[in-house]
């Protein structure tokens, strides 16, 4: 048993049929030592008397709020939550599995820039009764301060039958230097409780691997005098880390109709233009990526081959 | 040589061009690595990420661009020295910073040279002859630091009279062929930004 | 199977004009770029120019420009390439090549010899 | 025109050993970037795309790698069916243009 916060215990439990659970001693936070009795959540059923109680915590009905009166009047809370551990692996059951960029994959995190800033979130089909606490670092055996946010919920989706909740977070490292060469990753931690279950995830990266830039803006297009080409050009995102030529990026230029089967012109820049062949009802798309460290592609910014 | 900074053609900015193919030689490097050590720990999440040059040269600091100087967190370990010669350097006016940024960039490159070339007598002596270091990239090494052109004390190759661990020896490659991609990347973009300056 | 299906060799006489079909077959021929290169005996490949057979829309190579002429007519799935003015240094192989990305060639025909010879 | 240069232009090699051919470009063509391997009497055959992707059914000892002006084809260990001609092509710019060709004879 371990303290999440204050007045709230974690019980790591191992999970399987009649497994024997694990016997907690709670202990009444007050000065006095007589006429104390102990209740479970709304109920009224005394469990016991004395400053401290022992339970044998096996399953989720021994979890919940327990606490001490004297004489009608609350002294104390201890809240109890349970981690499951089934075959020696703590379980996963609040978040989804993104499976992206492997199985397991319950934290995303992507970055825009160098600076030291990046959002995680993750997914989840619980709507209610739902708690996130998020705390990150750099490194873990002398841990270098990042700052999180508090986790809100950022989208609501319909997948099939059930709907879909996506969380996120905002985080910052507290004193991080865009050049810098990182040696130790970024560890994310978010305690997930949901009633009365407690789970952990987390997630280890390099900001430059989880670098994903904005797409490119100001997209622009001038037909060339006699030709089928056209000449496209376009800006750095704003909020790509500066200066631009030192944090440089490389573009991929696409003309494509609305099919992602249909025929396309394709073509690779280190500059922010580009002469492509146009097509009737297609699209001219620009999209960014890290020039020299490839980490994702930012997504397509687009304007209408006409 | 002496060519001058201020110009967008690479053919002009030799060192560019070099660093280019530098980034292009480990990278390529680093997946044959991989592909060829699958059963050993050798991806970013595997390996411990060290830093043959920690405390030896100062590359981030002293090539930092002059726009991320105010950035307080950039500036912890800025130091100073007094080589100024080579040819990547625009003219005798070229900034102290830009000098001590070069032989600092330099002075890496032949750490590793003698780390990599280290590291391959041991891998040849592997009866497994599993995995050599790409002859490409040393002689990429090798180009850079002649563009660049610095006078320095030559550092004698290691010589071990041990038996190598070759299991050890691989995981050692991995870890070198990560750092030094991870410098080859700030190596590219400090002479992408000397080249637009 | 996606297959191009070149027409038989020619023989020319310099001055005069050739044209050379290419019939694809397997997947909707509207869908693929269209394009022409050459290669003259124990030479390198040298591109000519693409049709998108959607809509007739063409490009050639500038040394090709106004000798060169390609069409295509969706009801055949069939590209032609005509060349005019031919002179021996003309003598090649012609290769029709289609994908659906503009700038490079994942089909090929088998090849056309012309030999444009007096 | 962006002028493709190969070299070797003829490259010996035995059987089971590997094989690189190098092609630069006249002016920076990011990773725009095709080889093609052609037989005689054969058309080509397209076996890397931009630079370094490979094309389903082209054996994995084909490799590309390169972007900007330099790069490099690199088969990992010859079989007797990979002796063939061998063009690079740029798509940076219209006029498409190829290089001369590498001709890998058996050593």
């Known amino acids: 048993i371990w303290e999440l916060k204050k007045d709230v215990y974690v019980v790591e439990l191992d999970w399987y049929p009649d497994a024997p659970g694990e016997m907690v001693v709670l202990t009444c936070d007050t000065p006095e030592e007589d006429g104390i009795t102990w209740t479970l959540d709304q109920s009224s059923e005394v469990l016991g008397s004395g400053k401290t109680l022992t339970i044998q915590v096996k399953e989720f009905g021994d979890a919940g709020q327990y606490t001490c009166h004297k004489g009608g009047e609350v002294l104390s809370h201890s809240l109890l939550l349970l981690h499951k551990k089934e075959d020696g692996i703590w379980s996963t059951d609040i978040l989804k599995d993104q499976k992206e960029p492997k199985n397991k994959t319950f934290l995303r995190c992507e970055a825009k820039n160098y600076s030291g800033r990046f959002t995680c979130w993750w997914l989840t089909t619980i709507s209610t009764d739902l708690t996130f606490s998020v705390k990150s670092s750099r490194g873990s055996s002398d841990p270098q301060g990042v700052t999180c946010g508090a986790a809100t919920l950022s989208a609501e989706r319909v997948r099939g039958d059930n709907k879909e909740y996506e969380y996120s977070v905002e985080c910052q490292e507290d004193s991080a230097c865009p050049a810098a060469e990182e040696s130790l990753p970024i560890e994310v931690m978010v305690d997930a409780v949901h009633k009365l279950k407690y789970e952990n995830y987390t997630s280890s990266f390099f900001i430059r691997d989880i670098i994903k830039p904005d797409p490119p803006k100001n997209l622009q297009l001038k037909p060339l005098k006699n030709s089928r080409q056209v000449e496209v050009s376009w800006e750095y995102p704003d909020t790509w880390s500066t200066p631009h030529s030192y944090f440089s990026l490389t573009f991929c230029v696409q003309v494509q109709g609305k099919s992602k089967r249909e025929k396309k012109d394709r073509v690779f820049t280190d500059k922010t233009s580009a002469t492509v062949i146009c097509r009737k009802n297609a699209s001219i798309s620009v999209r960014a990526q890290d020039r020299y460290y490839s980490s994702s592609w930012s997504e397509w910014a687009s304007v209408p081959c006409s | 040589r002496n060519l001058p900074v201020a110009t967008p053609d690479p053919g002009m900015f030799p060192c560019l061009h070099h660093s280019q193919n530098l980034l292009r030689a480990v990278s390529n490097m680093l997946q044959k690595a991989r592909q060829t050590l699958e059963f050993y720990p050798c991806t970013s999440e595997e390996i411990d990420h060290e830093d043959i040059t920690k405390d030896k040269t100062s590359t981030v600091e002293a090539c930092l661009p002059l726009e991320l100087t105010k950035n307080e967190s950039c500036l912890n370990s800025r130091e100073t020295s007094f080589i100024t010669n080579g040819s990547c350097l625009a003219s005798r006016k070229t900034s102290f910073m830009m000098a001590l940024c070069l032989s600092s960039i330099y002075e890496d490159l032949k750490m590793y040279q003698v780390e990599f070339k280290t590291m391959n007598a041991k891998l040849l002596m592997d009866p497994k002859r599993q995995i050599f270091l790409d002859q490409n990239m040393l002689a990429v090494i090798d180009e850079l630091m002649q563009a660049l052109n610095f006078n320095s004390e030559t550092v004698p190759q290691k010589s071990s009279l041990e038996e190598p661990d070759f299991y050890k020896t691989k995981i050692k490659l991995c870890i070198l062929l990560h750092a030094f991609r991870i410098r080859a990347v700030t190596i590219d973009r400090v002479m992408s930004y000397l080249n637009a300056s | 199977q996606v297959q191009l299906v070149q027409s038989g060799a020619e023989v020319k006489k310099p001055g005069s004009s050739v044209k050379v079909s290419c019939k694809a077959s397997?997947?909707?021929?509207?869908?693929?770029?269209l394009h022409w290169s050459r290669q003259a005996p124990g030479q390198g490949l040298e591109w000519m120019g693409w049709?998108?057979?959607?809509?007739?829309?063409?490009e050639y190579a500038p040394k090709f420009q106004g000798r060169v002429t390609i069409t295509a007519d969706e009801s055949t799935s069939t590209a032609y390439m005509e060349l005019s003015s031919l002179r021996s240094e003309d003598t090649a192989v012609y290769y029709c090549?289609?994908?659906?990305?503009?700038?490079?060639?994942?089909?090929w025909g088998q090849g056309t010899l012309v030999t444009v010879s007096s | 025109d962006i002028v493709m240069t190969q070299s070797p232009l003829s490259l010996p090699v035995t059987p089971g050993e590997p094989a690189s051919i190098s092609c630069r470009a006249s002016q920076s063509i990011s990773i725009n970037l095709h080889w093609y391997q052609q037989k005689p009497g054969q058309a080509p055959r397209l076996l890397i795309y931009?630079?370094?992707q490979s094309i389903s059914g082209v054996p994995s000892r084909f490799s590309g790698s390169g972007s900007g002006t330099d790069f490099t084809l690199t088969i990992s260990s010859l079989q007797p069916e990979d002796f063939a001609t061998y063009y690079c092509q740029q798509s940076n710019s219209f006029p498409l243009t190829f290089g001369q060709g590498t001709k890998v004879e058996i050593k």
């Open positions: 090549a289609r994908n659906k990305e503009l700038r490079y060639f994942d089909v």
């Open positions: 397997g997947g909707t021929f509207s869908d693929y770029y």
């Open positions: 931009f630079a370094s």
């Open positions: 049709i998108d057979p959607e809509n007739g829309d063409t």
